[in-house]
Every structure is written in structure tokens, then in C-alpha cells.
């Protein structure tokens, strides 16, 4: 049974130019995660963290993806494009797969505010 | 074709090492993961460990800890496995085996779909 | 680490009879469980992944089911070419092997 649950940094602003750092926190589980994948918004890998192996950063984002801060990863150089949905996927064992999901703004706005607080989706 | 071509068969002392290499072909290399197996004769298969062909991390069995090294060289497309002070218990076949799962489908599978022909070890003084 | 355990070690069959191969984990491993096919002298070959997944140009008289602990392989129709040594295989880390199961010609 999967007793987890996936906790996100929610929905986010950043500014052009700026760099984010998307966040998700698997809790209420004693599931050992196996790899945590990070998708853009038309579902294509920006990144890997495979428990074993470590990052794997897509060639096509190297330049602009970071890994990290522990199993999340942060997005640099923003541009308009960025702007859409994350989704981060927990491979569990035994539970499973667990999805969270984050929604990001790119404000062209120097006053964009980048919000760090956890939501459950 | 999609392939793995190892090195030949070795003899080799008790207290020795050996290097057994694995040469990919017909896929981007540094997309996937290379396990190694082996196979003493007459017995079952025996996971080693693996490495990333993407940024050289490696994981081993425990067994082997400290007496195996995997290593890539990406300019080559090969993979490498090294092991230390050699005993009889040792005498294998040697597989390599590519991981199912590209790092880029995101699927853990932990599954091996193509492997190397072998090469035999023979432990022997 | 888990433990896999094949049954039966080997067994009896004839051309044509259906065959069933069971994999037991020593602990949960979801669908984490993969199958070979390994002949005398050769390389295994992957026939199944993720409990019930078809490898590729593999024929379809082969099939897998199971998840959790229990595991099966199973082959509809048994040919000629089918009389080898069967591996399962889980991936939760470490991955592990089970002891294999020989079928040969009765």
C-alpha cells in the first residue's frame, strides 16, 4: 500500500535570467527510493538522480540544469519558454511510483518573487 | 548492430589481477549503464556491480568491495572491470551486460538486455 | 540483500507441453523482477522485464506474471529451442539471481 506522500515546492515565481530551484520531499513512507526523474512540461527528462549512480543531466539542459539541492534541481539562465509545469517522480520500493508536481512562472518583472514555500499538490 | 564485444580468455595466478574490457557499439554509450555478471562453471549468475557510462559512478556488491574497479573510457565506447588478489573461487565466466533502461526513458528497470559473449578466467597455480 | 528462490531446479518436458516456472522473493519487490534464457556456452538472453513485459523479438508463447513476492514464467507451447536454463532476476539494489531452473527433454 502506498502510505507516502509528496510534498512540492507548489506554484513559483521567478524572474528572466534568474535561476529556481525546483524541490519535492517524499513523506510518510519508509519506501527506499531508487531514482528520482525531474520532467518539463511536454514530459521530456531534464534529469536524473539514480540512488546508485547519481545525476544523469539530460545533454540538451546541461548548461542550464543544476542538480540539486539534495534530490532537487535547480534551473538557471530563465527564459519565457521555462514557464509551465514540473512534475518530479519518486521510484519506490516497494511502494512504487509517487508524482508531485510544481508550476513555474517566469516573470519578465523585476519584482518577480520567488516563493520557497511547500505545498501538498 | 546493438553489441558488446569483450576481451579473450585469461589465466592467471592465485593473488593476481585481471582486466577484462567491453567494447559498445551501435548505440550512444554514455546513455546507458553497464552491469558485470559472472558465471563460475556449472553454477547461476552473480550480479558484480555496475557504472554509469554517463558520469562514471559505480555501485558494487559487497562480496567484491574493495577487490573490483569498473571504469569507462567514453572516448573508446569501452567499458572496463578490474579485479584484485585473484582465487580459485574466482575462475568465472566474465559478462557485461547493458542496462535496459536508458538513463533518458526514466524507466528502473534494472534489466539487462544485451550482453557481452564472455570471457573465461581461470584462477589456477 | 533479497533472496530469489527458482522451483523446480529442472524439470521433464516434451514438445508442445506448457511449462511454469516460479520465482519466490524473500521480500516484497513490486514488479522490480526480470527473466533469462541461457544456453550451454552462450550469453543469457532477456526474455521478460518488469514481472509481465515482452522483451523485444522475443516469441509470444512466453509470458510473466506476478508481483509482490511471486513470480512465474511461463512458456504456452514448448519448442525445440526452448530447452535451456531459465533465470529470474530482481533489481531492487543489489540486484540478485535466482539459482536457475534447467528444462530439458523428457
Known amino acids: 500500500m502506498m502510505t507516502g506522500t509528496i510534498e512540492t515546492t507548489g506554484n513559483i515565481s521567478a524572474k528572466k535570467g534568474g535561476s529556481v530551484i525546483l524541490q519535492c520531499h517524499l513523506s510518510s513512507t519508509m519506501a527506499q527510493v531508487t531514482q528520482v526523474n525531474w520532467e518539463q512540461h511536454d514530459h521530456s527528462l531534464l534529469a536524473i538522480r539514480n540512488a546508485e549512480l547519481g545525476w544523469h543531466i539530460y545533454p540538451a539542459f546541461k548548461d542550464r540544469v543544476a542538480p540539486g539541492p539534495g534530490l532537487g534541481l535547480t534551473l538557471q539562465s530563465l527564459t519565457m519558454n521555462d514557464t509551465g509545469e514540473y512534475f518530479c517522480t519518486y521510484h519506490t520500493y516497494p511502494d512504487g511510483t509517487y508524482r508531485g508536481r510544481i508550476f513555474l512562472e517566469v516573470l519578465e518583472s523585476s519584482v518577480a518573487e520567488h516563493s520557497a514555500r511547500f505545498q501538498i499538490p | 548492430q546493438v553489441q558488446l564485444v569483450q576481451s579473450g580468455a585469461e589465466v592467471k595466478k592465485p593473488g593476481a589481477s585481471v582486466k577484462v574490457s567491453c567494447k559498445a557499439s551501435?548505440?550512444?554509450?554514455?546513455?546507458?549503464?553497464i552491469s558485470w555478471v559472472r558465471q563460475a562453471p556449472g553454477q547461476g549468475l552473480e550480479w558484480m556491480g555496475w557504472i554509469s557510462a554517463y558520469n562514471g559512478n559505480t555501485k558494487y556488491a559487497q562480496k567484491l568491495q574493495g577487490r573490483v574497479t569498473m571504469t569507462t573510457d567514453t572516448s573508446t565506447s569501452t567499458a572496463y572491470m578490474e579485479l584484485r588478489s585473484l582465487r580459485s573461487d574466482d575462475t568465472a565466466v566474465y559478462y557485461c551486460a547493458r542496462d535496459l533502461s536508458s538513463f533518458w526513458s526514466g524507466d528502473v528497470l534494472g534489466a539487462f538486455d544485451i550482453w557481452g559473449q564472455g570471457t573465461m578466467v581461470t584462477v589456477s597455480s | 540483500d533479497i533472496q530469489m528462490t527458482q522451483s523446480p531446479s529442472s524439470l521433464s518436458a516434451s514438445v508442445g507441453d506448457r511449462v511454469t516456472i516460479t520465482c519466490r522473493a524473500s521480500?516484497?519487490?513490486?514488479?522490480?523482477l526480470n527473466w533469462y534464457q541461457q544456453k550451454p556456452g552462450k550469453a543469457p538472453k532477456l526474455l521478460i522485464y518488469?514481472?509481465?513485459s515482452l522483451q523485444s523479438g522475443v516469441p509470444s508463447r512466453f509470458s510473466g506474471s506476478g508481483s509482490g513476492t511471486d513470480f512465474t514464467l511461463t512458456i504456452s507451447s514448448l519448442q525445440p529451442e526452448d530447452f535451456a536454463t531459465y533465470y529470474c532476476q530482481q533489481s531492487v539494489p543489489p540486484r540478485t539471481f535466482g539459482g536457475g531452473t534447467k528444462v530439458e527433454i523428457k
Open positions: 521480500q516484497s519487490i513490486s514488479s522490480y
Open positions: 551501435g548505440y550512444t554509450f554514455t546513455s546507458y549503464a
Open positions: 518488469a514481472a509481465s
